[in-house]
Amino acid sequence: AADSNPRGVSAYLSRPSPFDLFIRKSPTITCLVVDLAPSCGTVNLTWSRASGKPVNHSTRKEEKQRNGTLTVTSTLPVGTRDWIEGETYQCRVTHPHLPRALMRSTTKTSGPRAAPEVYAFATPEWPGSRDKRTLACLIQNFMPEDISVQWLHNEVQLPDARHSTTQPRKTKGSGFFVFSRLEVTRAEWEQKDEFICRAVHEAASPSQTVQRAVSVNPGK
Amino acid sequence: AADSNPRGVSAYLSRPSPFDLFIRKSPTITCLVVDLAPSCGTVNLTWSRASGKPVNHSTRKEEKQRNGTLTVTSTLPVGTRDWIEGETYQCRVTHPHLPRALMRSTTKTSGPRAAPEVYAFATPEWPGSRDKRTLACLIQNFMPEDISVQWLHNEVQLPDARHSTTQPRKTKGSGFFVFSRLEVTRAEWEQKDEFICRAVHEAASPSQTVQRAVSVNPGK
């Protein structure tokens, strides 16, 4: 099958993040090849489109891992309209030691759509942590699973490194859920005690975003 | 190195779950071997203890995966006292196609200890889902990362399949956090509107458990 693996080497092809697709409007897809043995010839990653139309210029990155293997990524900018209209993109991986080329393809997810529900909570004061609180955001029942999560404070988007968001998991029903966790300081909540958890998802209307505000001292 | 992998085959050795260790008091450890090519000779998994003392009888399971590879697990019951006192257990994996044996070892995690903080929240009613609510539990700032999460209703532990709990992730500080999500029905909360999220962790006192109650209709 086109998507089977020669043993020991894996290739993955991502879809654009909803944030890049709908907010930044500069979507990219990434072809990731892992577990390559280094110094065994060059890995070639070649992009194509099912429509036969030309592809943009891609960016390549090689990284040697701690376990001695090589990871190669190639990032391809795609057209917002092309992606939304269902274009399929292929990444072909060749290497002297691979018995055959690895082929990966990606396209917009098919199937039913459902907008996310967003809920945000603040933890109460905990002994010994008076000047720190944790905010939690539960985003659930969305389909498909592609979602971007952001936190905002006073209309400023906080850096992604500030929060930790889980990978989408299946609910008992047909949708998906994620949790996001943000630690905030007293200085932040006393500046302005309103933090916003925002989900970017294709089924959300209007403008592909749903958000919920949360305060450390609610009702105050 | 003892823990390096022949390419394409991986072995993992788990620690006992805190629930098995402290509540059931029948801890087990599992040696998991993945990505084996089937019908290429027998895989042997052999257990030993660093102290040289004998090991209990282990249980073996083989499973063919969708991608055509074979997964082999061996589960070994260990003594609660032996584990707590720091015994090291080894799993040795041999196979005709492996250039050398795979060795994995496990022992009680060293380093600082911190008890979990447990916070539980209920989602408000969402249009179109009047007879269902989601409960969320944030468990954080614990060390080491080994934790078991349970939900209880009417003093009865709900089956693990009822909830979805994330893998431990690092906080900004030195500890770890997990989220757990439980869907409950109107029939359940109208029977008794109190659900308990319980964390089992070695640093929790007393009796290695910390819990928090949550209601769908608080203060009603």
């Epitope: 008076r130 006073n154 209309e155 400023v156 006393e190 500046q191 005690d193 305060s215 105050k220 | -």
Partner: antibody, heavy 122, light 107 residues
Framework: EVKLVESGGELVQPGESLRLSCSTS????????MSWVRQPPGKALEWLGF??????????EYSTSVKGRFYISRDDSQNILYLQMNTLRPEDGATYYC?????????????WGQGTSVTVSS | DIQLTQSPASLSASVGETVTITCRTS??????LAWFQQRQGKSPHLLVY???ILAEGVSSRFSGSGSGTQFSLEINSLQPEDFGTYYC?????????FGAGTKLELK
């Protein structure tokens, strides 16, 4: 209507102590952080410090110019804010305002009292 | 501590005119800036907070703008009650500090 009424300002000698009070009405005092701000004659405003609400353990913050000499406290049962001023200096002479901090923007202030005058002179 | 520099220190204007007062901060305070008006012999009165949010009951002739380190307060169609001293104050962190003031006088 939010009302803040300061009292206790008077003429004192350097080195003496003085306690100012601020009676409040028209809002739920217990919910709010409360500040003191002063203004020497013909000069700019200077923030002295604030006290947090009960939910935030009544903790206090002070400007470096008064830290260790001035102490803010509150009596939630009477809706009164206090400023205890010790070891007063001539440069402490000013109009002292009791000020309510905003909700949500806790470092911002909204309502001010009419002020009470303190003179420090020998 | 964050320093606030107001300019001009004083200005004269006539009723009906539009004036702008600026406040520069010594470090980035995002939008955490408030403006107060103080009439002669009276207490200060909050006009604007979070750079641009008008306080309750304040005339829409007042408008605040800016972020980072540069802020301004604009007063349109000056009225007799607008004359006095205007102060900016950051509400970004502790200690809270005020500008030295801008005295707006009737020409």
């Amino acid at each position: 209507e939010v009302k803040l009424v300061e009292s206790g300002g008077e003429l004192v000698q350097p080195g003496e102590s003085l306690r100012l009070s601020c009676s409040t009405s028209g809002f739920t005092f217990t919910d709010y952080y409360m500040s003191w701000v002063r203004q020497p004659p013909g000069k700019a405003l200077e923030w002295l410090g604030f006290i947090r609400n009960k939910a935030n353990s009544y903790t206090t913050e002070y400007s470096t110019s008064v830290k260790g000499r001035f102490y803010i406290s509150r009596d939630d049962s009477q809706n009164i804010l206090y400023l205890q001023m010790n070891t007063l200096r001539p440069e402490d002479g000013a109009t002292y305002y009791c000020v309510r901090n905003k909700k949500v923007y806790y470092y911002a202030v909204d309502y001010w009292g009419q002020g009470t005058s303190v003179t420090v002179s020998s | 501590d964050i320093q606030l520099t107001q300019s001009p220190a004083s200005l004269s204007a006539s009723v009906g005119e539009t004036v702008t007062i600026t406040c520069r901060t010594s470090e980035n305070i995002y939008s955490y800036l408030a403006w107060f008006q103080q009439r002669q012999g009276k207490s200060p009165h909050l006009l604007v907070y979070d750079s641009k949010i008008l306080a309750e009951g304040v005339s829409s002739r007042f408008s605040g703008s800016g972020s980072g380190t540069q802020f301004s307060l604009e007063i349109n169609s000056l009225q007799p009650e607008d004359f006095g001293t205007y102060y900016c104050q950051h509400h970004y962190g502790i200690p809270l500090t005020f500008g030295a003031g801008t005295k707006l006088e009737l020409k």
